[in-house]
């Protein structure tokens, strides 16, 4: 007789997760020399310790704590930059400005990426049918508490000029309620964050707006300002030629406005 | 200069206490609270073992060998965490180790401190 399992809204753990983690974690480790010494197994078993066996709408940063030991690693404290959706743009830009970080470009970030998962309380399966939606469901599901214990602890690395990249074709500009809005802007340490900069990444052809006057960035200047955080703002009018010139600095067509 | 100090050790009889205390210094722990912080200790001929941990939301967790007896907590207004142990026995003698640690900052450790519990 089939055992009934729960029926959550949102989609089930991603196929061949554990092979997926694995796999991504030798790779990292095999191309960053700073991250050899993990034991990709064992950050496996980390991970799964977290959410295995556990109600997947019961998790707690706690449960990824192992995790997030074994994933220790030192980023640059003035080379991150976040995001907030606009993740392709943000991840072709530090792949050409080796030197700067996203979340995804950490162990951990890259482990997870686009990766959904969750188990089922008291069984050791992992549930691949469904998992809980942040909406529909429960917030302190495994996908969601991760993202937030991960971008809770990146925000904290953060010092001097911290750079967000936003996407300026959307209707809210700043979403206090995206992990960036919700997560990582409160757990920026004023005590060695000097300023944010947001870069405001323009959609349309021939959209020559001052996006920084959205009234959602101003919200985020407001909330930044009383944390004691300086806040200043960019249009990046063409992104294509931003990129072009992050690759191409001395490129002539470089010194003028993008 | 990123430094742990750990201070507190000694010499003790069976049942009586200790308190270490682990001070943090350097630029790195300019805001120590965000660090999770720990104990751990190795015995003669022994592993290194996890004692006691707290995190920066403060939860703590202890080895099953030692709960009851020994409490791990913090002053981040001093830089500083604590190991409280009480009714120690032979079997706790170690050189104990402070451990401060996030996962985008890193892993730092103390030189150590030795605790011998003897009659």
């Known amino acids: 007789v089939p055992r009934w399992r729960q029926q959550w809204s949102g989609p089930g753990t991603t196929k061949r997760f554990p092979e997926t983690v694995l796999a991504r974690c030798v790779k990292y480790t095999e191309i960053h020399p700073e991250m050899r010494h993990v034991d990709c197994q064992s950050v496996w078993d980390a991970f799964k310790g977290a959410f295995i066996s556990k109600h997947p709408c019961n998790i707690t940063e706690e449960d990824y704590q192992p995790l997030m030991k074994l994933g220790t690693q030192t980023v640059p404290c003035n080379k991150i930059l976040l995001w907030s959706r606009i993740k392709d743009l943000a991840h072709q830009f530090t792949q050409v400005q080796r030197d700067m970080f996203t979340l995804e470009d950490t162990l951990l970030g890259y482990l997870a990426d686009d990766l959904t998962w969750c188990g089922e309380f008291n069984t050791s399966k992992i549930n691949y049918q469904s998992c809980p939606d942040w909406r529909k469901d429960c917030s302190n599901n495994p996908v969601s508490v991760f993202w937030k214990t991960v971008s809770r602890r990146f925000a904290e690395a953060a010092c001097d000029v911290v750079h967000v990249m936003l996407n300026g074709s959307r209707s809210k500009i700043f979403d206090k309620n995206s992990t960036f809005g919700s997560v990582e802007v409160h757990n920026l340490q004023p005590e060695k964050v000097q300023t944010l900069e947001a870069w405001v990444i323009h959609g349309g052809r021939e959209d020559s707006r001052d996006l920084c006057q959205d009234p959602t960035i101003k919200e985020l200047e407001s909330i930044i300002s009383k944390r004691n955080i300086q806040f200043s703002c960019k249009n990046i009018y063409r992104p294509d030629k931003f990129l072009q010139c992050v690759k191409n600095p001395e490129d002539s067509s470089c010194t003028s406005e993008i | 200069q990123v430094k742990l100090e750990e201070s507190g050790g000694g010499l003790v009889q069976p049942g009586e206490s200790l308190r270490l205390s682990c001070s943090a210094s350097?630029?790195?722990?300019?805001?120590?609270?965000?660090?999770?912080m720990s104990w751990y200790r190795q015995g003669p001929g022994k592993q290194r073992e996890l004692v006691a941990s707290?995190?920066?939301?403060?939860?703590?967790t202890y080895a099953e060998s030692v709960k009851g007896r020994f409490t791990i907590s913090r002053d981040n207004a001093k830089n500083t965490a604590y190991l409280q142990m009480d009714s120690l026995k032979p079997e706790d003698t170690a050189v104990y180790y402070c451990n401060a640690d996030h996962t985008f900052t890193g892993d730092f450790w103390g030189q150590g401190t030795q605790v011998t519990v003897s009659s």
């Open positions: 707290i995190s920066s939301g403060e939860t703590t």
């Open positions: 350097g630029s790195i722990f300019k805001v120590f609270r965000v660090f999770a």
